[in-house]
């Protein structure tokens, strides 16, 4: 019969031959033959390979270096990496978490919109009108200015969107 | 048809060095099979693993003889090779390379004798 | 690690069926599908006869078959043939690219 030109999923050409790929977690040894099977062998501890594959090595699984303030997320097994996240009060610096700097905090004047997680950065938001924050903060949302009216008290300062509003007694004298 | 075939001193005297060479024919080492293996058997006795070595040069050894044996490789002279160090009587053997790790192309085997 | 454990000797007469045991441990035989198998007839190199437990190479007869339990695999040959007497060997994957052997089985047909 005429050698094969192409092959079937999880099969590759090699030497006018239709091969079987290696599954996920193992690596290949030897292309089969007109014997036997292709060869294929586990990959070892801290090793993996997540596809169908003819790789002669395993990766190595991601180290995840606490020095950079780097932890483990979810432990490789031999089909998958490791992943990596930040400590606490850091996040990623990349999609493929290398290296992790510190949460960045809202100035005063600024809210938290969104806390940031191991992967995203927080993010702020302008105090808007009637809103604010005194404080730098990854954590505070902004507050809204204190009602002096529910207090049975009047405004003696008006609030910005760095400080909240002063309330003082209603002038009694006025009519 | 992939051959291969080990050559080497027949007689090694005790504390010197075994050196053992298998030369692949028939087929690259380098593609194909990417492992190259190396298993003994003393007279009368079962066979043992020694080691096996990838094309580009990693090499995993059996831990009983780890410290004493070097496998490498000359993907050039399609060749892969055995050392043995501060060899005994305990080394004498008949000493076969095998492609892969599954072992099914094997060399003849070559006889080495360790005595004074 | 150590040697994988097999009868010395096995017999049968022609036409029986033989079973050849293989007893590892977790590491190796138990802790991987690659148990292979060997024929060595008298100042001969081994022979491939089972891999991967269960996998004939092809021109191996089909009298030849392998299991595994366990941590035991075991290599049956139905309709012994005279030309089946031979030592037969074991062998397991046990990780981190390490192989080990069993100790060898001499099958003798009566």
């Known amino acids: 019969p005429e050698p094969p030109t192409a092959c079937r999923e999880k099969q590759y050409l090699i030497n006018s031959q239709c091969c079987s790929l290696c599954q996920p977690g193992q690596k290949l040894v030897s292309d089969c033959t007109e014997f036997t099977e292709t060869e294929c062998l586990p990959c070892g501890e801290s090793e993996f390979l997540d596809t169908w594959n003819r790789e002669t090595h395993c990766h190595q699984h991601k180290y995840c270096d606490p020095n950079l303030g780097l932890r483990v997320q979810q432990k490789g097994t031999s089909e998958t990496d490791t992943i990596c996240t930040c400590e606490e009060g850091w996040h990623c610096t990349s999609e493929a978490c290398e290296s992790c700097v510190l949460h960045r905090s809202c100035s005063p004047g600024f809210g938290v919109k969104q806390i940031a997680t191991g992967v995203s950065d927080t993010i702020c938001e302008p105090c808007p009108v009637g809103f604010f924050s005194n404080v730098s903060s990854a954590f505070e949302k902004c507050h809204p200015w204190t009602s002096c009216e529910t207090k049975d008290l009047v405004v003696q300062q008006a609030g910005t969107n760095k400080t909240d509003v002063v309330c003082g007694p209603q002038d009694r004298l006025r009519a | 048809q992939l051959q291969l075939q080990e050559s080497g001193p027949g007689l090694v005297k005790p504390s010197e060095i075994l050196s053992l060479t298998c030369t692949v024919s028939?087929?690259?080492?380098?593609?194909?099979?990417?492992?190259w293996g190396w298993i003994r058997q003393p007279p009368g006795k079962g066979l043992e693993w020694i080691g096996n070595i990838y094309y580009r040069g990693d090499t995993y050894y059996s831990p009983s003889l780890k410290s004493r044996v070097t496998i490498s490789v000359d993907t050039s002279k399609n060749q892969f090779s055995l050392k043995l160090n501060s060899v005994t009587a305990a080394d004498t053997a008949v000493y076969y390379c095998?492609?892969?790790?599954?072992?099914?192309?094997w060399g003849q085997g070559t006889l080495v004798t360790v005595s004074s | 690690q150590s040697a994988l454990t097999q009868p010395p000797s096995a017999s049968g007469s022609p036409g029986q069926s033989v079973t050849i045991s293989c007893t590892g441990t977790s590491s190796d035989v138990g802790g991987y599908n690659y148990v292979s198998w060997y024929q060595q007839h008298p100042g001969k190199a081994p022979k491939l006869m089972i891999y991967?437990?269960?996998k004939r190479p092809s021109g191996v007869p089909d009298r030849f078959s392998g299991s595994k339990s366990g941590n035991t695999a075991s290599l049956t040959v139905s309709g012994l043939q005279a030309e089946d007497e031979a030592d037969y060997y074991c062998s397991s994957y046990a990780g981190s690219n390490n192989l080990v052997f069993g100790g060898g089985t001499k099958l003798t047909v009566l």
């Open positions: 028939g087929g690259s080492i380098s593609s194909s099979s990417y492992y």
């Open positions: 095998a492609k892969g790790f599954r072992f099914d192309y």
């Open positions: 991967e437990v269960s």
